[in-house]
């Protein structure tokens, strides 16, 4: 679970009667509204390890829609447009937090869940294990 | 906020007295613990667009530690180890959910927050704007 700091001005979370749940305000504060949203824009097409984006939808989860990246090739695209299979296109994965409705279908009760998502792809040199 | 489905078996969230907060269980369920964690392992070093990982720590946030990627070069690394500046190393960014303590320092009250993080880097062909 979450390591909770103690603070004398707050309810005692170590009380044996204190629930393992917390209150979460659903009005999302977006700290990035003012940032330049260049994000990963068209990188998925221009990358030497291009990827497609697939919609992963789950109404029991928040966010209900997550876009997952899937590399287009096993190898990497060369300047001439051909694929070099001596290099590898690999997904960059990240563990993210989502909220899972618990009990199912109920709108005001959730459980934190960690899921691993593929965000995009990068081109790597393969690992070659040399036998002694 | 979150689009909340109606369900007759759950408390009425549209009640005017119903808070804009929900209960969240902090015992995190990890859906990917059983999978082969090939993850992004050492890709940050083996990529043609390598990156460094920087620790971003904030005790008022959960997760309190987030690792941010910063591309090592403007260009991409060639097979001979030199950097090709005709290509660009760019960060792949993703919007993620975090929990922000609100009021500050209190352990059992949070607000959902979206932040943009750089997960890794990919090598892209630059956009060339031709003047008419």
């Amino acid at each position: 679970g979450i390591a909770i700091p103690r603070n004398s001005g707050c309810p005692n979370s170590e009380d044996k009667n204190f629930p393992r749940t917390v209150m979460v305000n659903l009005n999302i504060h977006n700290r990035n509204t003012s940032t330049n949203p260049k994000r990963s824009s068209d990188y998925y097409n221009r990358s030497t390890s291009p990827w497609n984006l697939h919609r992963n939808e789950d109404p029991e989860r928040y966010p209900s829609v997550i876009w997952e990246a899937k590399c287009r090739h096993l190898g990497c695209v060369k300047a001439d447009g051909n694929v070099d299979y001596h290099m590898n296109s690999v997904p960059i994965q990240q563990e993210i937090l989502v909220l899972r409705r618990e009990p199912r279908h109920c709108p005001n009760s959730f459980r934190l869940e960690k899921i691993l998502v593929s965000v995009g792809c990068t081109c790597v040199t393969p690992i070659v294990h040399h036998v002694a | 906020g979150i689009a909340i489905p109606r369900n007759s078996g759950c408390p009425n969230s549209e009640d005017k007295n119903f808070p804009r907060t929900v209960m969240v269980n902090l015992n995190i369920h990890n859906r990917n613990t059983s999978t082969n964690p090939k993850r992004s392992s050492d890709y940050y070093n083996r990529s043609t667009s390598p990156w460094n990982l920087h620790r971003n720590e904030d005790p008022e946030r959960y997760p309190s530690v987030i690792w941010e990627a910063k591309c090592r070069h403007l260009g991409c690394v060639k097979a001979d180890g030199n950097v090709d500046y005709h290509m660009n190393s760019v960060p792949i960014q993703q919007e993620i959910l975090v929990l922000r303590r609100e009021p500050r320092h209190c352990p059992n009250s949070f607000r959902l927050e979206k932040i943009l993080v750089s997960v890794g880097c990919t090598c892209v062909t630059p956009i060339v704007h031709h003047v008419a």
């Epitope: 997952e68 090739h73 690992i127 | 859906r31 090939k38």
Partner: antibody, heavy 126, light 112 residues
Framework: EVQLVESGGGLVQPGGSLRLSCAAS?????????MCWVRQAPGKGLEWIGC????????YYASWAKGRFTISRDNSKNTVYLQMNSLRAEDTAVYYC??????????????????WGQGTLVTVSS | DIQMTQSPSSLSASVGDRVTITCQAS??????LSWYQQKPGKAPKLLIY???TLTSGVPSRFSGSGSGTDFTLTISSLQPEDFATYYC??????????????FGGGTKLTVL
């Protein structure tokens, strides 16, 4: 416990159809897993049938399996299926369900299969 | 389709021996090759993927090498539990329409 359990095998007449199921437990199909089917005739070697990406539903088949064999999935049930039509005596085999070793976003199931079911026997005979 | 030719098809050896099994692809599959071990009545077990990467939990006496069309599985010092049938498998795909996961014919390793 992470496991795969096949079911649906049995005796079927030549020309008949059969649908095999593979139920996964201990991991969720949410995301990109490659789930594959492999068969083994009695006393013979392994024969790859095909795979499905649980994320986008893309299927990949051995050339000999295209047309007669169809792989599908139901992510809500964490189950993959193998629909077999126009069965012949030479389709008699133990059918295995297996999972590719790499999770998430690889272009193809290119990392070998690290998790296998116990297999289900299909006998095609009159 | 890519053809995978494994040799020898059968092999007798003793505990402590060094054993080598080869696998040849009919065209280049780069490093996209896996090796499996199968014992009678059991499902196969993945030993090596990407030609030389050992799967977690597999003893270090197993090693793989090769790229392109020629690959080798080596058991440096044979143990009693290693007597089984070994299969290689191509894991190479070029496009959704061209995909090859062909297995080799197998090598049955028995006690001399």
């Amino acid at each position: 416990e992470v496991q795969l359990v096949e079911s649906g095998g049995g005796l079927v007449q030549p020309g008949g159809s059969l649908r095999l199921s593979c139920a996964a437990s201990g991991f969720s199909f949410s995301g990109f897993y490659y789930m594959c089917w492999v068969r083994q005739a009695p006393g013979k070697g392994l024969e790859w049938i095909g795979c499905i990406d649980t994320g986008d539903g893309t299927t990949y088949y051995a050339s000999w399996a295209k047309g007669r064999f169809t792989i599908s999935r139901d992510n809500s049930k964490n189950t993959v299926y193998l629909q077999m039509n126009s069965l012949r005596a030479e389709d008699t085999a133990v059918y295995y369900c297996a999972r590719d070793a790499a999770y998430g976003g690889y272009a193809y199931p290119a990392h070998g299969m690290d998790l296998w079911g116990q297999g289900t026997l299909v006998t095609v005979s009159s | 389709d890519i053809q995978m030719t494994q040799s020898p098809s059968s092999l007798s050896a003793s505990v402590g021996d060094r054993v080598t099994i080869t696998c040849q692809a009919s065209e280049s599959i780069y490093r996209y090759l896996s090796w499996y071990q199968q014992k009678p009545g059991k499902a196969p077990k993945l030993l090596i993927y990407l030609a030389s990467t050992l799967t977690s939990g597999v003893p270090s006496r197993f090693s793989g090498s090769g790229s392109g069309t020629d690959f080798t599985l080596t058991i440096s010092s044979l143990q009693p539990e290693d007597f089984a049938t070994y299969y290689c498998q191509s894991n190479f795909g070029t496009a959704s329409t061209t995909y090859y996961n062909t297995f080799g014919g197998g090598t049955k390793l028995t006690v001399l």
